[in-house]
């Protein structure tokens, strides 16, 4: 070993090294947290970067850049180091226009944290074997909600947009003549029946167990769909996120409300039978799954 | 195919009457909103006649006040236009209009549905 590696070796092994990295790393979180910072905070920027790409040249020149095994780059934590010099190195020299974004990566310094701290390290990894132990059941998951996807889509679609019209018009008005100018706030609120308080008209169905609508209004289909246009089944995409949105049990009573009124009390058993599953199983599943990822590190 | 089906249009002489059948007999056609009769005089735009809609009130235009009555009879889906005391320039092709929602089998769709016009003449 020449006398350069082994000095390096010496400060990569002092436990004084792996105490500067740390407090280097929390004062940097310190910094990170100011909201104005001081013109001076850029020389202590300057001074952070300078410590970081000195344990980096250190760790490169005890154990050697990427050929070999147990080299700087093998080992994926050194990744992320290198990582944050880079972009500490671009920010700061290379004009690249939108710099604020660039910036977000300075975060990312914070993660180190992570390397230096024993504890920590094996958590995060428990974390990531529990990721990996978890896509059997992601893919039983995903496979799951495009069932009952596909299926809300052939009972559902469209059904959402089902709302309570107004039984009088002008004389040169018909139903598509509104329908194609349709656009604000106050158009809708014009022709349609809307609950008090409520932001969206009130939904019916054509079904005799659906919602019915009030004395002068009927049930028509048109318009956009509730809440913004973002809840519907009228695309398998929508129907998958209303799916995830049962099983994470995410304001779902309004869904199973909305659906219910516009479809039908029998559509309840669909409702049922997703909570079931999706909610009640899937997510207890993936819980023991991490569960038993942690207690596999642990030993 | 989503038809509305009329009938009762032909030559009538002025002061005449003649009574206009709209029949939504198919099983495609829900629910109206209204149901109306629109009529087009050669080289003018189609014009409201009146119209009934699905809670059973009526409009009318200033034209037809006093001498047309339209009436539905749910029982059997069909709207009825009584025409009187009818005057030459009450010559026309008589459209009847579905304004609502049909089934198409497949989905529910709400719009304008058209027939295919009976035609009135008033002549002596």
């Known amino acids: 070993f020449s006398p350069l590696r082994r000095i390096s070796i010496k400060i990569l092994v002092h436990s004084l090294f792996s105490m500067l990295i740390m407090c280097t790393i929390l004062t940097n979180c310190i910094f990170m947290t100011m909201n104005n910072p001081p013109d001076w905070t850029k020389n202590v920027e300057y001074t952070f970067t300078g410590i970081y790409t000195f344990e980096s040249l250190v760790k490169i020149l005890a154990r050697g850049f990427c050929v070999g095994e147990f080299t700087f780059l093998r080992d994926p934590w050194n990744w992320l180091d290198f990582v944050v010099i880079v972009f500490a190195y671009l920010t700061e020299f290379v004009n690249l226009g939108n710099v604020s974004a660039l910036r977000t990566f300075r975060v990312l310094r914070a993660l180190k944290t992570i390397s230096v701290i024993p504890g920590l390290k094996t958590i995060v990894g428990a974390l990531i074997q529990s990721v990996k132990k978890l896509s059997d059941v992601m893919i039983l998951t995903v496979f799951c909600l495009s069932v009952f996807a596909l299926i809300g889509l052939q009972l559902f679609m469209g059904n959402l947009k089902h709302k309570c019209f107004r039984n009088s018009l002008e004389n040169n008005e018909t139903l598509e003549s509104i329908m194609n100018t349709l656009e604000s706030e106050e158009d809708f609120r014009k022709y349609f029946y809307y609950l008090e308080g409520s932001k969206d008209a009130l939904l019916c169905g054509f079904s005799t167990d659906s919602g019915q609508c009030p004395e002068g209004y009927t049930c028509v289909k048109i318009g956009r769909n509730p809440d913004y246009g973002y809840t519907s089944f009228d695309t398998f995409s929508w129907a998958f996120l209303a799916l995830f949105r049962l099983m994470t049990q995410d304001y779902w009573e309004n869904l199973y409300q909305q659906t219910l009124r516009a479809a039908g009390k029998t559509y309840m058993i669909f409702f049922v039978v997703v909570i079931f599953l999706g909610s009640f199983y899937l997510i207890n599943l993936i819980l023991a799954v991490v569960a038993m990822a942690y207690e596999e590190q642990n030993q | 195919e989503v038809q509305l089906v009329e009938s009762g249009g032909g030559v009538v002489q002025p002061g005449g009457s003649l009574r206009l059948s709209c029949a939504t007999t198919?099983?495609?056609?829900?629910?109206?909103?209204?149901t109306g009769w629109y009529r087009r005089v050669p080289g003018k735009e189609r014009e409201l006649v009146a119209r009934?809609?699905?809670?059973?009130?009526?409009n009318y235009a200033d034209f037809a006040k006093g001498r047309f009555t339209i009436s539905r009879d749910n029982a059997k889906k069909t709207v009825y236009l009584q025409m009187n005391s009818l005057r030459p320039e009450d010559t026309a092709l008589y459209y009847c209009?579905?304004?609502?929602?049909?089934?198409?089998?497949?989905?529910?769709?709400?719009?304008?549905?058209w027939g295919q016009g009976t035609l009135v003449t008033v002549s002596s």
């Open positions: 209009l579905f304004s609502g929602t049909i089934n198409t089998g497949r989905e529910y769709r709400s719009g304008d549905y």
């Open positions: 198919s099983r495609a056609f829900i629910r109206d909103v209204f």
């Open positions: 009934i809609y699905n809670g059973g009130n009526t």
